[in-house]
Interface confidence: medium
Amino acid sequence: KAMHVAQPAVVLANSRGIASFVCEYASPGKATEVRVTVLRQADSQVTEVCAATYMMGNELTFLDDSICTGTSSGNQVNLTIQGLRAMDTGLYICKVELMYPPPYYMGIGNGTQIYVIDPEPCPDSD
Amino acid sequence: KAMHVAQPAVVLANSRGIASFVCEYASPGKATEVRVTVLRQADSQVTEVCAATYMMGNELTFLDDSICTGTSSGNQVNLTIQGLRAMDTGLYICKVELMYPPPYYMGIGNGTQIYVIDPEPCPDSD
């Protein structure tokens, strides 16, 4: 079943290569187990960036080597992606799945265009 | 009289606060004197960033204290805006006027969204 997911159109990564955005979903039921996946679309290729499952009211748990972190608050998920470089500029799509209890719902946002600018290297300190 | 002006939708300023984009116009006549104005739209306020007049085939002449520089090639103007900070993020609109000889033509582009990220300060060198 389809579900509406909202996310900002554009976000700028900061000079340390960190970008944060909110992914909000219109939950049709009382889900206790939610799965959030971030997909990157570039040059018509879609790749998975990271994924996490969380229990309502708990923190998001990404894998240890994930470039994503996040927190949840109600139907909002605050996602942070780090280690971004200019070449990672692209459309980052938030996919939300209500895993449990049934019925299963899934929604995909329109994507957040994340722009990343590589910083100038600092001069060597002598 | 109206004239079509094209410019890119999005440009990122580099880490030194410099953004460049091309403003292209469809000249209906043989203009010898062309005026280019860059306008910034933010929060429904439109302000003039810089303006220059150029003779076909010559450099653009901005006032000495202008934050803009540019070159022209045929019906294309290559604009560079410098000294940008994160607070300068906004929609930069290219306005082109064919000043002489008559008839006068004017065209306004849809704007280029320029994103600016302030760099992290470098650590002090001891």
């Epitope: - | 004197e33 005026r35 003039e48 007049t53 003779m55 450099e59 002489y100 006068y104």
Partner: antibody
């Protein structure tokens, strides 16, 4: 046909004031920067002041700053020059000019004489 | 400020002569130079703009050349109506202008 017609000149005592006007026709006045240029008797041309199309940005020759004020009314196709604290050396024919980067269009001029 | 220097300050010539007036800018002004003609009691008239572009309605015997700091106005074959004073003007600092001191062209 493009026409620029100046008015408001005359004889004024040192320290006095005058307001010059320039009525434009035959071109889209609001599209163009406009300027005042003056010429003292038997002398060359001297740029006085210019104003951008919107009327918000104004430029003055150093010797006129603080004494002269340029303005425009695009709805009336008119350019103005308010001259205060006039001096004998301000005696000149004042021309209204414009039409682009170069001064394509000129008025016939109005004579301002500053004398006691 | 950009200074404009014209030479000569006056020149005597005859109908049919070829006359050249020069103008030098104190710094580079690319092609942002105009030439004006002024007759006694009349407003200046734009002859040449952008260093070499002939203003509409100006006879083709008038021509301009130059780039950067050195410019010339040439009248290929003087006509009686050409005796007047000629001014160069820089527009590099547009809309703040500077004029040359003028060159008076007199009948020999």
């Amino acid at each position: 046909e493009v026409q620029l017609v100046e008015s408001g000149g005359g004889l004024v005592q040192p320290g006095g004031s005058l307001r010059l006007s320039c009525a434009a026709s035959g071109f889209t006045f609001s599209n163009y920067e406009m300027s005042w240029v003056r010429q003292a008797p038997g002398k060359g041309l001297e740029w006085v002041s210019s104003i951008r199309t919107s009327g918000t940005t104004k430029y003055y020759a150093d010797s006129m700053k603080g004494r002269f004020t340029i303005s425009r009314d695009n709805a009336k196709n008119s350019l103005y020059l308010q001259m205060n604290s006039l001096r004998a050396e301000d005696t000149a024919v004042y021309y209204c000019a414009g039409g682009g980067t170069f001064l394509h269009y000129w008025g016939q001029g109005t004579l301002v004489t500053v004398s006691s | 400020d950009i200074q404009m220097t014209q030479s000569p300050s006056s020149v005597s010539a005859s109908v049919g002569d070829r006359v050249t007036i020069t103008c030098r800018a104190s710094q580079g002004i690319a092609s942002y130079l105009a030439w004006y003609q002024q007759k006694p009691g009349k407003a200046p008239k734009l002859l040449i703009y952008a260093a070499s572009s002939l203003q509409t309605g100006v006879p083709s015997r008038f021509s301009g050349s130059g780039y950067g700091t050195d410019f010339t106005l040439t009248i290929s074959s003087l006509q009686p109506e050409d005796f007047a004073t000629y001014y160069c003007q820089q527009a590099k600092s547009f809309p703040m202008y500077t004029f040359g001191q003028g060159t008076k062209l007199e009948i020999k």
